[in-house]
Amino acid sequence: QRFAQAQQQLPLESLGWDVAELQLNHTGPQQDPRLYWQGGPALGRSFLHGPELDKGQLRIHRDGIYMVHIQVTLAICSSTTASRHHPTTLAVGICSPASRSISLLRLSFHQGCTIASQRLTPLARGDTLCTNLTGTLLPSRNTDETFFGVQWVRP
Amino acid sequence: QRFAQAQQQLPLESLGWDVAELQLNHTGPQQDPRLYWQGGPALGRSFLHGPELDKGQLRIHRDGIYMVHIQVTLAICSSTTASRHHPTTLAVGICSPASRSISLLRLSFHQGCTIASQRLTPLARGDTLCTNLTGTLLPSRNTDETFFGVQWVRP
Amino acid sequence: QRFAQAQQQLPLESLGWDVAELQLNHTGPQQDPRLYWQGGPALGRSFLHGPELDKGQLRIHRDGIYMVHIQVTLAICSSTTASRHHPTTLAVGICSPASRSISLLRLSFHQGCTIASQRLTPLARGDTLCTNLTGTLLPSRNTDETFFGVQWVRP
């Protein structure tokens, strides 16, 4: 009886510790609003445990509900810079597969130089997340100012 | 065979439920930009389960990847207050041991009175996190306006 | 001996995967500052696994420490809109039972059009969370701009 109970418990590998924290690599060419990310211990404090990068975009490897978070700071920015070049907007969404394309999280900078937010969302294996920065302002590449990550929360 | 499978599973104590949510105690003397935190059920809704406070700074007790989050609101603040006393910046970082000193998260207030953000970061046992508020504005001590916390996420 | 060790492990159902992510349904009548939420796969990417909705407010079903997060964006808003109608404030709190009534998280919009934050807080079975938006501005109902969620973190 006690043995059967042990069988109900959760194997370590099924806990789905999938998690990633990325730093900005570069912006796209003019007509491409996507931010391109990079991660790995050689780069500092960024990492990928489960998800992968596909041409700078984050691809999910395990179905589940994820906490998605992001912070983007505009480079050498003041509130006048931000208002001068308004509207500058950041959107995080599933960009592929196309059939699942949707915006998950959207924020405008208005007179601020940083946006930061987070949300819970279901993601499926193969979903690729894109972060689109619309407007003409260059984001900061400082690793404590601009980052993007996901954390698997439950099946 | 089924017994061997049970052995792969995760012991409760290794789940590492380390978590802390702190409220502002006080600011430092003039030349010390650090915020000093406090936590515990006697104080309200703040708590420490695993991490500890060392002279108002948060010390980590378990290696792992943590979600670090913070919100700081400036006291009796309006957008004119904030812009008048610009730059006011909040930085969260590892301040000791000195060999691991690094800024993890940084935000400026610009014309706003509140900053809030979160990120995933690897932390090691013994890391002490400091939150530096640069500028001359006093932060609110209201527990729903200013708080700082960490949550262990995975090994 | 090894069998006893297996017994220390955590049954799946006690992991308490309670989690919810909600989208805005509607605002209350004039004298009611509460936001009314909705969730469920039929509505898009919102869901409730454990917690329930009670007349548009989120009710907790499991004791524990929760990560509470929220983002609210004001409808058709610019920084001038926001400053013109100041103060607009968002507060998340326990509104029932009355004996546990408390504000957990509070933010003002000032010259911005979006607030976003998160915090760890202990919640008990039966706690109902209310989100109060004071001021005269209407929040956006876009699901990527306004959302509210909780995630069970530990007992």
């Epitope: 900005l24 003019q30 700071t73 505009l74 480079a75 050498i76 920015c77 006048t80 810079t81 208002s83 001068r84 070049h85 308004h86 407007g135 003409t136 302002l137 260059l138 984001p139 900061s140 590449r141 400082n142 690793t143 100012e145 | - | -």
Partner: antibody, heavy 120, light 111 residues
Framework: QVQLQQSGPGLVQPSQSLSITCTVS????????VHWVRQSPGKGLEWLGV???????DYNAAFISRLSISKDNSKSQVFFKMNSLQADDTAIYYC??????????????WGQGTSVTVSS | DIVLTQSPASLAVSLGQRATISCRAS??????????MHWYQQKAGQPPKLLIY???NLESGVPARFSGRGSGTDFTLNIHPVEEGDAATYYC?????????FGAGTKLEIK
């Protein structure tokens, strides 16, 4: 293609004002900022000021009291006016477009320049 | 104001060789993970032409013979191999803060 065409006088009397019009094509003034720079043998290249896509301006503190930059988006024209010119204001005056990134102040397309001599 | 000092004031380089021009800023022009230093080429009777922005990014249409590097206060523009059409004056410009300032220029002559 992107072009900036300048028109303005070549000779200005001392203490008088200088007005130059920069007419742009191939891009919109509602998207890009336009800078003004002058070049003289004695002082090299000097940045004078900028008008941003939203119409606000920033000026070099050395010229702020006598410089004015404005624009008409619908006509794709930027207007430069400097008052109280003296002999040491003799230079070639350029308008130039800011690159795509609004917070990186570099100039990717330049007007042909207006050679201005201040003399009586 | 940030002062930019270019060196040498002039140099002569043989066809096919490397030309290296330096620019030193009176304070760091680094911010937000970038170096806010740009390079221009100006030929006689023409306006300046942008070659490099943000220290190392090649402007569209500029040959890969041109490259920029550096950070903080010290920057270099390299041209290799030098061609006859590269005879011009080269200027650095910072945009770390206002006012923008330019270096005094380096005149490149092809031997």
């Amino acid at each position: 293609q992107v072009q900036l065409q300048q028109s303005g006088p070549g000779l200005v009397q001392p203490s008088q004002s200088l007005s130059i019009t920069c007419t742009v094509s191939g891009f919109s003034l509602t998207t890009y900022a336009v800078h003004w720079v002058r070049q003289s043998p004695g002082k090299g290249l000097e940045w004078l000021g900028v008008i941003w896509s939203v119409g606000s301006t920033d000026y070099n503190a050395a010229f702020i009291s006598r410089l004015s930059i404005s624009k008409d988006n619908s006509k794709s024209q930027v207007f430069f006016k400097m008052n109280s010119l003296q002999a040491d204001d003799t230079a070639i005056y350029y308008c130039a477009r800011n690159i795509y990134y609004g917070n990186v102040y570099a100039m990717d397309y330049w007007g042909q320049g207006t050679s201005v001599t201040v003399s009586s | 104001d940030i002062v930019l000092t270019q060196s040498p004031a002039s140099l002569a380089v043989s066809l096919g060789q490397r030309a290296t021009i330096s620019c030193r800023a009176s304070k760091s022009v680094d911010a937000s993970g970038y170096s806010f230093m740009h390079w221009y080429q100006q030929k006689a009777g023409q306006p300046p032409k942008l070659l490099i922005y943000l220290a190392s990014n090649l402007e569209s249409g500029v040959p890969a013979r041109f490259s920029g590097r550096g950070s903080g206060t010290d920057f270099t523009l390299n041209i290799h191999p030098v061609e006859e059409g590269d005879a011009a004056t080269y200027y650095c410009q910072h945009s770390r803060e206002l006012p923008l300032t330019f270096g005094a220029g380096t005149k490149l002559e092809i031997k």
